[in-house]
Amino acid sequence: SGVFQLQLQEFINERGVLASGRPCEPGCRTFFRVCLKHFQAVVSPGPCTFGTVSTPVLGTNSFAVRDDSSGGGRNPLQLPFNFTWPGTFSLIIEAWHAPGDDLRPEALPPDALISKIAIQGSLAVGQNWLLDEQTSTLTRLRYSYRVICSDNYYGDNCSRLCKKRNDHFGHYVCQPDGNLSCLPGWTGEYCQQPICLSGCHEQNGYCSKPAECLCRPGWQGRLCNECIPHNGCRHGTCSTPWQCTCDEGWGGLFCDQDLNYCTHHSPCKNGATCSNSGQRSYTCTCRPGYTGVDCELELSECDSNPCRNGGSCKDQEDGYHCLCPPGYYGLHCEHSTLSCADSPCFNGGSCRERNQGANYACECPPNFTGSNCEKKVDRCTSNPCANGGQCLNRGPSRMCRCRPGFTGTYCELHVSDCARNPCAHGGTCHDLENGLMCTCPAGFSGRRCEVRTSIDACASSPCFNRATCYTDLSTDTFVCNCPYGFVGSRCEFPVGLPPSFPW
């Protein structure tokens, strides 16, 4: 689509005569008829296939033509066409005398013609005017002409339609040749694809507008290169989405089991020493003069029962004093004057004489201890349970209650989380310290490979009329790129084209 423009500049008819040589009365009131048609080697009468245009009366005899509207006409004259410019043309310009106001051909006598010129040749589309002058024996016409494309049409033949846009369907302006020139921040054939923030992770990030970086589920940060830990995770981090790798001192699947209660809570008071003894459990070793689970209670020196072998304690200003029962002596009544003859060993302990019978030693049966086998053994004091297991006294024996994920007499064995085949769709299971991880086959994702991904939406050939199909991987949908002349989401509708011309 374009316009053939003809600019009439000057017409000279000094004698004011018609083509027949007869003079006009009182002068030649001159108007022009223009016929534009396809190229003819010899320009002959016939249909003006590219169009016609007439002017009003522009002047009398000889005159210059203003290059704007003149008496309702227009200069330059416009001959629009709705087809591909062929590059060649024929042009007929007739100057006529108008005796009255009716300029219709049928209202004029045939001898009202002043002059007629006919030219033909090639003409490329362009902004530059071609100047021409045609002279006959009695008249001279100076004019210029050019072909330009209509709005939104481009190219050598005005055949490329391009309309700048900045919406969902594209973000571009048009180059002189009709090619698209994407607006800043957009790319792709139709400039529909935003250019994400520089550095935005190719797989984990995407964008819906330029310089944006939005993260896919499980990723975070400016460039979507940091993972998000599992929803239930409490004191852990991740290296891939939804993991929960425990911070130091925490255990369990969601890192919610406190393995370092001493550091996290400092429960022991009055300078006592804290020892971790499993999940959320600890032991305080009190300094002299303190007692209680957390050594929170102050006691007199006798409260710690320093006198052994039944000695009685007496508080004194500078400490305490032990009153020993018969057969014992020493600061804490720790020395015995007894011998094996006095049967000093309790709970079935056997007595052995030492230092030629001056004293003795008791050999205690299992479960008993003390110099006289008077104390029952607490088998849990040595913390025998591994991996945060809880020790329980059970009569003559002990047992370990294990945390989830561990087994064995002493909780020393790690239970395989993979034993129950948790990975779907043929995923490979890997045991980790705090759970498991699935490596998914192609086409599946998710923590357990339960999510099907990357369906080829183009597999069903949804696009018509030789359109190109593209799969949008973010939504598993297709987009059809239509060839020229077709529209619609599947390129199923032909665009209404102009009728063909006979030349």
């Epitope: 819906s208 939005l214 993260c215 896919r216 589920p217 499980g218 990723w219 975070q220 940060g221 400016r222 940091e226 998000i228 830990p229 929803n231 239930g232 995770c233 409490r234 004191h235 852990g236 981090t237 911070d247 998710g446 923590r447 339960e450 999510v451 991904t453 939504t475 598993d476 949908t477």
Partner: antibody, heavy 118, light 107 residues
Framework: EVQLVESGGGLVQPGGSLRLSCAAS????????MAWVRQAPGKGLEWVAT????????YYRDSVKGRFTISRDNAKNSLYLQMNSLRAEDTAVYYC???????????WGQGTLVTVSS | DIQMTQSPSSLSASVGDRVTITCRAS??????LAWYQQKPGKAPKLLIF???NLADGVPSRFSGSGSGTDFTLTISSLQPEDFATYYC?????????FGQGTKLEIK
């Protein structure tokens, strides 16, 4: 036990400002992205803003962009929402939540009511 | 923005009933869907994430299913403490969006 406790809500005139705070405990705050979600009286839930855990990247719903600012202080285990140029339509209970815009909101505070009225 | 549409908006049922709430997304959100329970005057509580994974401490009578655009929350046998409002939420596309809610009332 995870705990999120919001404070700072109240009555404010249109065009006014408020700063909401959220104190977090029971989890390693610096490891997790955080968000604010609001609920207008008798209405549904509406995501407001999100902040990532390490680099502090922020995202906002369109209607609050340029007026609200989400921030965090990992040393204080605290999340904040600075609300400026408040409008009547911002009236809601504001919840502090653990989550991002692309993950579930796993834990929620009890909420703090913001009323914008003249 | 992705629109999330829940149905029904409200529902009356009795203790012991099996109840299903549906949620439809305006475009494919894969399995990136969560369900929340909210009781009057309280904060929402996460029930289900990734369409069908139960959050910590949620009773097994709750279950979720679906993928793409259509999802359901099922309570196999209603208990008195289950009467509340339930919301679905998608976190596949930015910004995250919630359904309008389904109020579950005692019959």
């Amino acid at each position: 036990e995870v705990q999120l406790v919001e404070s700072g809500g109240g009555l404010v005139q249109p065009g006014g400002s408020l700063r909401l705070s959220c104190a977090a405990s029971g989890f390693t705050f610096s490891n997790f992205p955080m968000a604010w979600v609001r609920q207008a009286p008798g209405k549904g839930l509406e995501w407001v803003a999100t902040i990532s855990s390490s680099d502090g990247t922020t995202y906002y719903r369109d209607s609050v962009k340029g007026r609200f600012t989400i921030s965090r202080d990992n040393a204080k285990n605290s999340l904040y929402l600075q609300m400026n140029s408040l409008r009547a339509e911002d009236t809601a209970v504001y919840y502090c939540s653990r989550g991002y815009y692309n993950s579930p909101f796993a834990y929620w505070g009890q909420g703090t009511l913001v009323t914008v009225s003249s | 923005d992705i629109q999330m549409t829940q149905s029904p908006s409200s529902l009356s049922a009795s203790v012991g009933d099996r109840v299903t709430i549906t949620c439809r997304a305006s475009e494919d959100i894969y399995s990136n869907l969560a369900w929340y329970q909210q009781k009057p005057g309280k904060a929402p509580k996460l029930l289900i994430f990734d369409t069908n994974n139960l959050a910590d401490g949620v009773p097994s009578r709750f279950s979720g299913s679906g993928s793409g655009t259509d999802f359901t929350l099922t309570i196999s046998s209603l208990q008195p403490e289950d009467f509340a409002t339930y919301y679905c939420q998608q976190y596949n596309n930015y910004p995250p969006t919630f359904g309008q809610g389904t109020k579950l009332e005692i019959k």
